[in-house]
Interface confidence: medium
């Protein structure tokens, strides 16, 4: 039989008597920054090279007894989860271990920095194939540790880290809060977030995805053939490091942005019971459990997009929140969300030569989030077209007028505090898909892109009666790039994309009368790239 | 013992070669900032990562570290450079009194300083 965790990450076509997916990460080197390890354990013998790097603090307590098997416990188990010959994810991956955690599992930010620097220097001295760095550790938010992770990621290294076991917002911890790092939360065999004593897995917008992290069988440092069950976000991160090694072995040219998008795309969606998370974190936390792709090749034709939430703006009147895409990604749309419903919309704007998504708080509002839709669109040329507030009662409208440019997203931003109160909704004229329509007192921003073979269409779903949530999804083969609400519905809290579904949230229906204002329309822009599909077929 | 002698020797050289005061003041309007862990029990006061501006060369990092040691010595403080960073981030790791932070923040090339803190196996 196959342990639950390996079964969970394995697509059905791989599931045989043994977990033996093809090409187990043999082209990839995984660096593990952890405790010392027992390298002669049967699971990892010959697969893990113990480097001479060691930077650890003294153990606490004068009577601390250093017992080798305890010192090696955490690192040995994780090395086994990544590449163990029987209980590992990427059985072909080779590993290198750096000791940055002492026998009590404690290290320092500075020791971790020096470890990351050691990896970078090793990479420069002897460039090998793709590198994955596993950081199964967490400390408080650290600007310097996040900066070091960013630099290493920009040097082409894939960093995977534990979200943390503090049952808290992962953004308060490092390296979990570093945007360039793939941050992994932990779930159990029932797809519940993992509880660890009184605490449990971290959550929130800084988590990229979840992976098995409870009751994970792996190498025990008690003996060379011993096994033990361990739990935590370290174990979850080790699964993702293994999956990343498998994917990179199949496609060594994948960039970090491409790998992250694929990890998200191939994850199991909407299987986690979100009730475990604090209410204010549910919308921010990805409902994704990592899985291997069903085949090692052939995903290149898809248009991959992901949703990136900003930090909360804070409640001050002029507060703004900014959501950014990764360097290799295109911002295809921008939306905003406020729990109080008091917001002044959002806009796409250039910052440092790159588009960002900025949301604006309103007077009396508790704050807003900006939500960016970040996509992989090779050879894209995107720009924002803005229309200032219109004088006419028909509302503001803007379209993509450049030849070959298609509409990928609509945003609207207004200066007045309470837009649209007691005003009838403005309906989009039919047959004009390349056009954004907004309230006459709002400025409207259209994201217009030109890319080989890119085609987009608008899909709407309107509900006449008040409804707390209205959704519209893109069909198979199309990817959601834009998500917004039709203007004129003043009680809308905001719009955001969840996987391939556009969600428009409204105030609690009990507070809204069932007038025409109760009507809510969710507008999705769905795109696909014929060019990517064609390129993929040519490779077959 | 050998290691300590080496540090002492570097300190003496630094004392001879550096003039008191700031030879290169930080660029006008850019103030270096200090950061520390929000979780008090995880703080490790006495060890600091001094992060220098992005394009700083290794030689400048070493020079800045020596300058800090020299200026600290004149004020009667002993400091120890534990590591000089290059390859990922320019900067250095220093063991020193928190009293010297104000001085360190005014050094040329300094972007920010972060107090060391603990990380834990998860």
């Amino acid at each position: 039989s196959i342990p639950w965790n390996l079964e969970r990450i394995t697509p059905p076509r791989y599931r045989a008597d043994e977990y033996q997916p093809p090409d187990g990460g043999s082209l990839v080197e995984v660096y593990l920054l952890d405790t010392s390890i027992q390298s002669d354990h049967r699971e990892i013998e010959g697969r893990v090279m113990v480097t001479d790097f060691e930077n650890v603090p003294e153990e606490d307590g004068t009577r601390f007894h250093r017992q080798a098997s305890k010192c090696d416990s955490h690192g040995t188990h994780l090395a086994g989860v990544v590449s163990g010959r029987d209980a590992g994810v990427a059985k072909g991956a080779s590993m290198r271990s750096l000791r940055v955690l002492n026998c009590q599992g404690k290290g320092t930010v500075s020791g971790t920095l020096i470890g990351l620097e050691f990896i970078r220097k090793s990479q420069l001295v002897q460039p090998v194939g793709p590198l994955v760095v596993l950081l199964p550790l967490a400390g408080g938010y650290s600007r310097v540790l996040n900066a070091a992770c960013q630099r290493l990621a920009r040097a082409g290294v894939v960093l995977v880290t534990a979200a943390g076991n503090f049952r808290d917002d992962a953004c308060l911890y490092s390296p979990a809060s570093a945007p360039e790092v793939i941050t992994v939360g932990a779930t159990n065999a029932q797809d519940q977030p993992v509880t660890l004593g009184t605490l449990g897995t971290n959550f929130g917008r800084c988590v990229d995805l979840f992976a098995p992290g409870e009751d994970i069988i792996g190498a025990s440092s008690d003996c060379s053939t011993c096994f033990v069950s361990q739990s935590g976000t370290s174990q979850a991160a080790a699964h993702v490091a293994g999956i990343a090694a498998m994917m990179l072995s199949a496609e060594p040219e994948l960039t970090l942005a491409e790998l992250r998008q694929r990890l998200i795309h191939f994850s199991a969606k909407d299987v986690i019971n979100e009730a475990w998370f604090p209410e204010d974190q549910r919308v921010l936390t990805p409902n994704l459990v990592a899985a291997l792709p069903p085949s090692t090749h052939g995903a290149g034709w898809q248009l991959f997009c992901r949703t990136v939430w900003s930090a909360h703006s804070g409640p001050t009147r002029m507060a703004t929140a900014v959501a950014r895409c990764a360097p290799d990604e295109e911002l295809l749309s921008c939306s905003s969300f406020s729990r109080s419903g008091k917001r002044r919309g959002e806009r796409m704007e250039a910052q440092g030569g790159k588009l960002v998504c900025r949301a604006h708080n309103a007077f009396g509002g508790e704050g807003v989030y900006a939500i960016a839709r970040c996509c992989l669109l090779p050879q894209a040329n995107c720009s924002v077209h803005t229309a200032p507030p219109a004088e006419a009662s028909m509302g503001t409208r803007v379209h993509c007028h450049q030849q070959g440019h298609v509409l990928t997203g609509c945003s609207s931003h207004w200066e007045v505090e309470d837009l649209g109160t007691h005003k009838p909704p403005v309906l989009r004229p039919r047959g004009q898909p390349n056009q954004c329509v907004g309230h006459r007192e709002a400025s409207i921003h259209a994201s217009c892109c030109h890319a080989p073979g890119l085609e987009c269409k608008v899909k709407e779903h309107g509900i006449p009666a008040p409804q707390e949530q209205v959704t519209v999804a893109c069909e198979e083969g199309w990817t959601l790039t834009g998500c917004s609400a039709l203007p004129g519905t003043s009680h809308v809290l905001g719009a955001y994309a969840v996987d391939n579904t556009c969600v428009v949230r409204s105030r609690d229906v009990s507070t809204t009368g069932s007038t025409s204002e109760g009507a809510v329309t969710a507008v999705a822009i769905c795109c696909r790239s014929r060019h990517l599909a064609q390129a993929s077929q040519e490779l077959q | 013992q050998e290691d300590e002698d080496g540090d002492y020797e570097e300190l003496v050289l630094a004392l001879r070669s550096e003039e008191d005061g700031l030879a290169e003041a930080p660029e006008h309007g850019t103030t270096a900032t200090f950061h520390r862990c929000a979780k008090d029990p995880w703080r490790l006061p006495g060890t600091y990562v001094v992060v220098l501006k992005e394009e700083t060369h290794l030689s400048q990092s070493e020079r800045t570290a020596r300058r800090l040691q020299a200026q600290a010595a004149r004020r009667g403080y002993l400091t120890k450079i534990l590591h000089v960073f290059h390859g990922l981030l320019p900067g250095f790791l220093v063991k020193m009194s928190g009293d010297l932070l104000e001085l360190a923040l005014k050094l040329p090339h300094v972007d920010y300083i972060e107090e060391d803190s603990s990380v834990f196996a998860q």
Epitope: P3, R42, E45, G46, R85, A87, I217, S224, C226, F227 | -
Partner: antibody, heavy 121, light 109 residues
């Protein structure tokens, strides 16, 4: 179907040596450790040693160090046991066994039929 | 080093009887204990691994329990084909060797 087939047993003079073979089929040979176990007539099972076919690493029972040498040929999916300086007390049935992994533990899950070695003048 | 002591060394029982064999390790071995059945002139066969997990194809009348130093193999209702010798086995990780118990011969009464 997993199968282990031993050969090479027979009558040996005291002080002599012999090489036993164990041909594996029905699974990936290099993925599983292999053991040699012997059983003297009317006695219990006694572990001799093991090999990791993946890298050739071996471990022996202290009692058999210097007397037994375990090797393998992955291209032939075959395990070997070389026994030297044989004495009458080495008379036994010799078994090869595969070391299988079962959710957090190992066990000798498949055994050969055994080959009898008789040491006598 | 670890010694594995099986008791009894032999027992007589009838078809349908409930039979219990014990294996005691000289020091704690967690759950790392396997049980094997050997019939005369045949190779041993794996019955139970990790103290209590039944190997596939083995009838459910066989069960294992225990952890640490004391382990038990139980045959809930003895069948004619169960008359054989039973061995426990574990790994002595201080010496890196595998240790078998002395065996328990189950004979027809």
């Amino acid at each position: 179907e997993v199968q282990l087939l031993e050969s090479g047993g027979g009558l040996v003079q005291p002080g002599g040596s012999l090489r036993l073979s164990c041909k594996a089929s029905g699974y990936t040979f290099s993925s599983y450790w292999m053991h040699w176990v012997r059983q003297a007539p009317g006695k219990g099972l006694e572990w001799i040693g093991r090999i990791d076919p993946y890298n050739g690493g071996t471990k022996y029972n202290e009692k058999f160090k210097g007397k037994a040498t375990i090797s393998r040929d992955n291209s032939k999916n075959t395990l070997y046991l070389q026994m030297n300086s044989l004495r009458a007390e080495d008379t036994a049935v010799y078994y090869c066994a595969r070391y299988g992994y079962y959710l957090g533990s190992y066990a000798m899950d498949y055994w050969g039929q055994g080959t009898l070695v008789t040491v006598s003048s | 080093d670890i010694q594995m002591t099986q008791s009894p060394s032999s027992l007589s029982a009838s078809v349908g009887d409930r039979v219990t064999i014990t294996c005691r390790a000289s020091q704690a071995i967690s759950k790392y204990l396997n049980w094997y059945q050997q019939k005369p002139g045949k190779a041993p066969k794996l019955l139970i691994y990790a103290a209590s997990s039944l190997q596939s194809g083995v009838p459910s009348r066989f069960s294992g329990s225990g952890s640490g130093t004391d382990f038990t193999l139980t045959i809930s209702s003895l069948q004619p084909e169960d008359f054989a010798t039973y061995y426990c086995e574990s790994y002595d990780y201080s010496l890196g060797r595998y240790v078998f118990g002395g065996g328990t011969k189950v004979e027809i009464k």
